[in-house]
């Protein structure tokens, strides 16, 4: 059920998962000069029941005299059962935080973690795309990608987003950060026919613009 590849890259766009499906694993990686504590967890695992999801395990890094050479690990299901549960939600989250059943939020930062987080996504995971600052969406369809299972293989759908290089500080109304809400996406596809639907680019431009409350400056 793990997704084989990373989500697709779109020129001049960035993507983010707003929540992580149960079964997602996050490697406990430390930045250079630090390593996982002895007997520390190799990964965090999003687990839960019908009413609540949370991250099992807690990543911890400690100073290291030698460079951390631990390999990235994709744990096997048997290993997962032996892990103890540690609640990793921030105690200072505003009360209106979005909550998607069957999903975990981004784990809070841990001390001296690696710059990049390495996630092992599961089928059904969705990531959302936006044009980076200085670019705007020219042709837009769903600016998202979903990991799907087809013919026993996983693939990420192609986000229908093109970012053009015209400097633009305004945003389309549809470019708000998605709220975590049930998507009702199928976790597998029964048909062997792969259509071009995921790859068709919509050519309609948004007719209205919405001024952002943010402006940007590059140092």
């Amino acid at each position: 059920e793990l997704c084989d590849d990373d989500p697709p890259e779109i020129p001049h766009a960035t993507f983010k998962a707003m929540a992580y499906k149960e079964g997602t694993m996050l490697n406990c990686e430390c930045k250079r000069g630090f390593r996982r504590i002895k007997s520390g967890s190799l990964y965090m695992l999003c687990t839960g029941n019908s009413s609540h999801s949370s991250w099992d395990n807690q990543c911890q890094c400690t100073s290291s005299a030698t460079r951390n050479t631990t390999k990235q690990v994709t744990p096997q299901p048997e290993e997962q059962k032996e892990r103890k549960t540690t609640e990793m939600q921030s105690p200072m989250q505003p009360v209106d935080q979005a909550s998607l059943p069957g999903h975990c939020r981004e784990p809070p930062p841990w001390e001296n973690e690696a710059t990049e987080r390495i996630y092992h996504f599961v089928v059904g995971q969705m990531v959302y795309y936006q044009c980076v600052q200085g670019y705007r969406a020219l042709h837009r369809g769903p600016a998202e990608s979903v990991c799907k299972m087809t013919h026993g293989k996983t693939r990420w759908t192609q986000p229908q987003l093109i970012c053009t290089g015209e400097m633009e500080t305004s945003q389309f109304p549809g470019e708000e950060k998605p709220q975590a809400s049930p998507e009702g996406r199928p976790e597998s596809e029964t048909s062997c026919l792969v259509t071009t639907t995921d790859f068709q680019i919509q050519t309609e431009m948004a007719a209205t613009m919405e001024t952002s409350i943010f402006t940007t400056e590059y140092q």
């Epitope: 989500p7 890259e9 960035t14 993507f15 983010k16 707003m18 930045k31 921030s90 200072m92 989250q93 505003p94 209106d96 935080q97 979005a98 939020r105 981004e106 784990p107 809070p108 930062p109 841990w110 001390e111 001296n112 973690e113 690696a114 710059t115 990049e116 987080r117 936006q130 044009c131 980076v132 600052q133 945003q171 470019e175 708000e176 950060k177 709220q179 952002s212 409350i213 943010f214 940007t216 400056e217 590059y218 140092q219």
Partner: nanobody
Framework: QLQLVESGGGLVQAGGSLRLSCAAS????????IGWFRQASGKEREGVSY????????FYADSVKGRFIISSDNAKNTVDLQMNSLKPDDAAVYYC???????????????????????WGKGTLVTVSP
């Protein structure tokens, strides 16, 4: 667990200046957007400014642009907010917050929303007298 600790709040006259600081010992700055929200009494928490810890790009709410300056010292793990020409409307509790960067170390302003932050400080009070 890693904590964010704000300091520098206080009472200032309109037109005056304050410098807020957020200490985030142990935070890997180049993996996060780090910045500030504020919440005035009876109002919703709103984004003020943030800095991309990877590329140093900065973002400001229109209401503070030209008056506030955000900066970071990655070696000291601090982010400062220099607030000039303060107005009574700037009075609020100011919260430090962090959010993971997106792919390629990029971050967009629509992500800087209270429900989506990964970690919050406890806040520091800024009072501006007329």
């Amino acid at each position: 667990q890693l904590q964010l600790v704000e300091s520098g709040g206080g009472l200032v006259q309109a037109g005056g200046s304050l410098r807020l600081s957020c200490a985030a010992s142990g935070l890997t700055f180049d993996g996060y957007a780090i910045g500030w929200f504020r919440q005035a009494s009876g109002k919703e928490r709103e984004g003020v400014s943030y800095i991309n810890g990877r590329d140093g790009s900065t973002f400001y709410a229109d209401s503070v642009k030209g008056r506030f300056i955000i900066s970071s010292d990655n070696a000291k793990n601090t982010v400062d907010l220099q607030m000039n020409s303060l107005k009574p409307d700037d009075a609020a509790v100011y919260y430090c917050a962090v959010d993971r960067l997106g792919s390629r170390g990029a971050y967009v302003s629509t992500w800087w929303r209270p429900p989506d932050m990964d970690l919050w400080g406890k806040g520091t009070l800024v009072t501006v007298s007329p």
